[in-house]
Amino acid sequence: MMTGTIETTGNISAEKGGSIILQCHLSSTTAQVTQVNWEQQDQLLAICNADLGWHISPSFKDRVAPGPGLGLTLQSLTVNDTGEYFCIYHTYPDGTYTGRIFLEVLESSVAEHGARFQIP
């Protein structure tokens, strides 16, 4: 029985050239998190594996940084980074939980950064 829920930063915006933290948090379950995938619809950005550590996809190595926690930091943002991002939590014994974040990268300096939180 999967009882957990994923909380995310939801819809967030950031300035072109800036950085943003993508953050998900799994709650309401005692399941053990064994791996977290960070993805776009057809691209793997990074994986954090409990045994193997972090893996950043080579095409994102220059502007993706692991953390904080199980989150992901995107740097040197471009307008092309606008879109959906997914955190995929692999857990034992529950299975897989998924959260979605929509990022809008704005040209102007009035971009409002969405609420952020750290994984305890």
Partner: antibody, heavy 118, light 107 residues
Framework: QVQLQESGPGLVKPSQTLSLTCTVS?????????WNWIRQPPGKGLEWMGY???????KYNPSLKSRVTISRDTSKNQFSLKLSSVTAADTAVYYC???????????WGQGTLVTVSS | DIQMTQSPSSLSASVGDRVTITCKAS??????VAWYQQKPGKAPKLLIY???YRPTGVPSRFSGSGSGTDFTFTISSLQPEDFATYYC?????????FGQGTRLEIK
């Protein structure tokens, strides 16, 4: 429980366009996920052809160049495959499949055999 | 494109045997590999994702391991219904690609 069902002509002439439809029941294709076409020539392995996402974004296998088009009819909860300029090498079982975010395929249709022959 | 090379291409075994199939990726895919079972005239069935995770309902005799470029799929004790063709697939980047398959036959 989501179910996928392929339909379309079982025989297509060389140089013509192959057209298939996948009807999805038990889940709206506009709610989530990416909806894919995967084919398997007789006695051979699997080839991913492309997808249309719940938002309408498409992605294709470059090996099929510009021959493939995937579209959808949200009113019928269907998505479709068109493959142009077919040859005998396009003879295959064509599957529609729902992709999970991680790039794997937990749900498939039963497949439909399309033969390209004159 | 990332090539996935499976071995062996065919394998004969008996009920109760432990069977191992390997898959080698042409580049580092970390843990982004899935395994499928396909029976004649049927669609593939997902058995393993992310190298080692079993979807709900898949028997525990099926397991996967590996990371980087080398991956292993194991059936700990073959059952009569396990005789089929098995495919690996990389889920690291598009175009998603499959191995050529391993046909598991009754000895």
């Amino acid at each position: 429980q989501v179910q996928l069902q392929e339909s379309g002509p079982g025989l297509v002439k060389p140089s013509q366009t192959l057209s298939l439809t996948c009807t999805v029941s038990g889940y709206s294709i506009t709610d989530d996920y990416a909806w894919n076409w995967i084919r398997q020539p007789p006695g051979k392995g699997l080839e991913w052809m492309g997808y249309i996402s719940y938002s309408g974004h498409t992605k294709y296998n470059p090996s099929l160049k510009s021959r493939v088009t995937i579209s959808r009819d949200t009113s019928k909860n269907q998505f479709s495959l068109k493959l142009s300029s077919v040859t005998a090498a396009d003879t295959a079982v064509y599957y529609c499949a729902r992709k999970y975010y991680g790039g794997w395929f937990p749900r498939w249709g039963q497949g439909t055999l399309v033969t390209v022959s004159s | 494109d990332i090539q996935m090379t499976q071995s062996p291409s065919s394998l004969s075994a008996s009920v109760g045997d432990r069977v191992t199939i390997t898959c080698k990726a042409s580049q580092d895919v970390f843990t982004a590999v899935a395994w499928y079972q396909q029976k004649p005239g049927k669609a593939p069935k997902l058995l393993i994702y992310s190298a080692s995770y079993r979807p709900t309902g898949v028997p525990s005799r099926f397991s996967g391991s590996g990371s980087g470029t080398d991956f292993t799929f194991t059936i700990s004790s073959l059952q009569p219904e396990d005789f089929a063709t098995y495919y690996c697939q990389q889920s690291y980047s598009t175009p998603w690609t499959f191995g050529q398959g391993t046909r598991l036959e009754i000895k």
